[in-house]
């Protein structure tokens, strides 16, 4: 039986500062049950970018409808893109647990660049 | 067309076992969660149980006496009760989960269920 | 664990007229709530998820709103096979997963 895999096709992305940056993410399987969040930077002192359960991420939507079922597209768009905003992207599976969830498997991380903007 | 077809309900005494299957058809079975809900008589619904791959999750009221398996080579879910009580008197279903994006859990198809009566 | 608390327990409805009924959850659960039918004698069957969305093949007359802590389910026009229990379930915070007591809707 194939365990579930996070796949993140683009190593890394560039994206000119003010337009938008599509992170593109997808899992091979439905199980384990559990959660999918992404996250920038890796370990201890990682940024949650997102996480539809909990939170306020106004910059960010998915492109998938959050009402579409048996989804296995994860991928986001992060709006209004600064020089700040570079960096690793990780999409990230959990395991439902009680009372918290575990990390399950990670994506090979996409890294976020940003060009000036255009003149 | 997804079928599940639930067996091995029947009447046993407090302290027994009893072992639930479900056969499952007409989906993929190994990629999706499935799950038992049980319903006294004349009562409502109550989860008992979920599956994913190696993820089990349990009611409180059952823990330590249900085990929820699978086995995706012949597309069955199984029960396997221990130490009944009177209070396990229930019609059990089994359903597959579905989940709408980002989010948990619902049923989308059920069995028709199977009576398990325990009774002295 | 969060609790589901449906009303009324009973709704007795004429043939042809609409019936309304609720599910209030004890904390939010967003949008994260289905809605079953029970028919005497058989297994439940989805209706409506993701508080507002008609399941595959269900008629147009079954409709869900609401988000947060208060839902409802609204039949226009009940037909007789309407006549039987609905469950609301909340899939936002579990385990466990949580159903409602059921609304019983019988023929006036």
């Known amino acids: 039986e194939d365990e579930l895999q996070v796949i993140q096709p683009e190593k890394s992305v560039s994206v000119a500062a003010g337009e938008s940056a599509t992170l593109r993410c997808a899992m091979t399987s439905l199980i384990p049950v559990g959660p999918i969040m992404w996250f920038r930077g890796a370990g201890a002192g990682r940024e949650l970018i997102y996480n539809q359960k909990e939170g306020h991420f106004p910059r960010v939507t998915t492109v998938s409808e959050l009402t579409k079922r048996n989804n296995l597209d994860f991928s986001i768009s992060i709006s209004n893109i600064t020089p700040a905003d570079a960096g690793t992207y990780y999409c990230v599976k959990f395991r439902k647990g009680s009372p918290d969830d575990v990390e399950f498997k990670s994506g090979a991380g996409t890294e976020l660049s940003v060009r000036a903007k255009p003149s | 067309d997804v079928q599940l077809v639930e067996s091995g309900g029947g009447v046993v005494r407090p302290g027994e076992s009893l072992r639930l299957s479900c056969a499952a058809s007409?989906?993929?079975?190994?990629?999706?969660?499935m799950t038992w809900v049980r319903q006294a008589p004349g009562e409502g619904l109550e989860w008992v149980s979920t599956?994913?791959?190696?993820?089990?999750y349990y009611a409180d009221s059952v823990k330590g006496r249900f085990t929820i398996s699978r086995d995706n080579s012949k597309n069955t879910l199984y029960l396997q009760m221990n130490s009944l009580r009177a209070e396990d008197t229930a019609v059990y279903y089994c359903?597959?989960?579905?989940?709408?994006?980002?989010?948990?859990?619902?049923?989308?198809?059920w069995g028709l269920g199977t009576l398990v009566t325990v009774s002295s | 664990e969060i609790v589901l608390t449906q009303s009324p327990a009973t709704l007795s409805v004429s043939p042809g007229e609409r019936a309304t009924f609720s599910c209030r959850a004890s904390q939010n659960v967003k949008n994260d709530l289905a809605w079953y039918q029970q028919r005497p004698g058989q297994a439940p069957r989805l209706l409506i998820y993701a508080a507002r969305i008609r399941e595959t093949g269900i008629p147009e007359r079954f409709s869900g709103s609401g988000s947060g802590t208060e839902f409802t389910l609204t039949i226009t026009s009940l037909q007789s096979e309407d006549f039987a229990v609905y469950y609301c379930?909340?899939?936002?915070?579990?385990?466990?997963?949580?159903f409602g007591g059921g609304t019983k809707v019988e023929i006036k």
């Open positions: 379930q909340q899939y936002y915070d579990w385990p466990p997963f949580t």
């Open positions: 359903a597959k989960d579905s989940t709408v994006s980002w989010s948990g859990d619902f049923f989308d198809y």
């Open positions: 007409g989906f993929r079975f190994s990629n999706f969660a």
């Open positions: 599956i994913g791959s190696g993820d089990t």
